[in-house]
Amino acid sequence: MMTGTIETTGNISAKKGGSVILQCHLSSTMAQVTQVNWEQHDHSLLAIRNAELGWHIYPAFKDRVAPGPGLGLTLQSLTMNDTGEYFCTYHTYPDGTYRGRIFLEVLESSGGGGAGGGGHHHHHHHHHH
């Protein structure tokens, strides 16, 4: 039975050209996290954090994605096209797969809202394959 929940940074905003930290946290389960996959709104993979093998940043994002902090991901040099949904997929044993969602809004530099600002609505979501 899956007892865990994923807590994420929820809906966040950041300025164009700035950076933002995408963060998820799995709680309420003793399951072992074997891998965390970070995915973008168009279903492309940004990065994989394998518990033993470390980080793999996808080639298309190597210039502007940095691993961490922790199991999170730092997205740099933001463009307006980065606006949208991001997903963290936790592969765990023995529970299976949990998934969390973050919505990032990238704001024009002249507008309000700092990097990582804009009201952090903690969002709980879990999903099993």
């Epitope: 074997t34 891998q35 996959n37 995915e39 279903h43 492309s44 993979l45 994989i48 394998n50 033993e52 093998l53 470390g54 980080w55 793999h56 996808y58 080639p59 298309a60 592969h91 394959h129």
Partner: antibody
Framework: QVQLQESGPGLVKPSGTLSLTCAVS?????????WHWVRQPPGKGLEWIGY???????NYNPSLKSRVTISVDKSKNQFSLKLSSVTAADTAVYYC??????????????WGQGTLVTVSS | DIQMTQSPSSLSASVGDRVTITCKAS??????VAWYQQKPGKAPKLLIY???YRYTGVPSRFSGSGSGTDFTFTISSLQPEDIATYYC?????????FGGGTKLEIK
């Protein structure tokens, strides 16, 4: 240039233990990467068996986990595979391979030439 | 486990032909797919990783595309030295799995 070379008995008796070694040259296996075993039954596809990470941790295919041990011999710069309680279904060409996870994800970029192991009495 | 189903299992083509091999994953694997070439009696060689990126030294006639569950491997102009069996592999999950292979022959 990294090179991998498998060695070990080509014939193993049913219920016995298959033991293979992969000698690595051109790179110290305790310096980085993960080191894998993959097998290919005659005329069939590839099956991942498991790996040993340079740190010493291991991970195995769940379907084989109860029978597999992969270990490292630092002094000889080699890693080994032991597969117990073998049957004819374990007859295959066994490959060792390297995975550069940081650059290529779960793709294996260097392979040994493979060694055929037949399980027969 | 995630199953990778390749098609066709074998195909025959002429030198200069455009050749396409497909691989279907049993669940969404995003772009965590690699392609290998294996010549008879030899070890597999990595050609493509992350679905569409050519490995170092791989000729430009080899390409990969796709995301989610459907992936394509293409040889734009078949050369005699391309005769081999080609395999896809997924690494989205922590248990890596390969397709059954596509054997490519010259007409």
């Amino acid at each position: 240039q990294v090179q991998l070379q498998e060695s070990g008995p080509g014939l193993v008796k049913p219920s016995g233990t298959l033991s293979l070694t992969c000698a690595v040259s051109g790179y110290s296996i305790t310096s980085g990467y993960s080191w894998h075993w993959v097998r290919q039954p005659p005329g069939k596809g590839l099956e991942w068996i498991g790996y040993v990470h340079y740190s010493g941790s291991t991970n195995y295919n769940p379907s084989l986990k109860s029978r597999v041990t992969i270990s490292v011999d630092k002094s000889k710069n080699q890693f080994s595979l032991k597969l117990s309680s073998v049957t004819a279904a374990d007859t295959a060409v066994y490959y060792c391979a390297r995975m550069d996870y940081g650059n290529y994800g779960g793709a294996m970029d260097y392979w040994g030439q493979g060694t055929l192991v037949t399980v027969s009495s | 486990d995630i199953q990778m189903t390749q098609s066709p299992s074998s195909l025959s083509a002429s030198v200069g032909d455009r050749v396409t091999i497909t691989c279907k994953a049993s669940q969404d694997v995003r772009t965590a797919v690699a392609w290998y070439q294996q010549k008879p009696g030899k070890a597999p060689k990595l050609l493509i990783y992350s679905a569409s990126y050519r490995y170092t030294g791989v000729p430009s006639r080899f390409s990969g595309s796709g995301s989610g569950t459907d992936f394509t491997f293409t040889i734009s102009s078949l050369q005699p030295e391309d005769i081999a069996t080609y395999y896809c592999q997924q690494y989205y999950s922590t248990q890596w799995t390969f397709g059954g292979g596509t054997k490519l022959e010259i007409k």
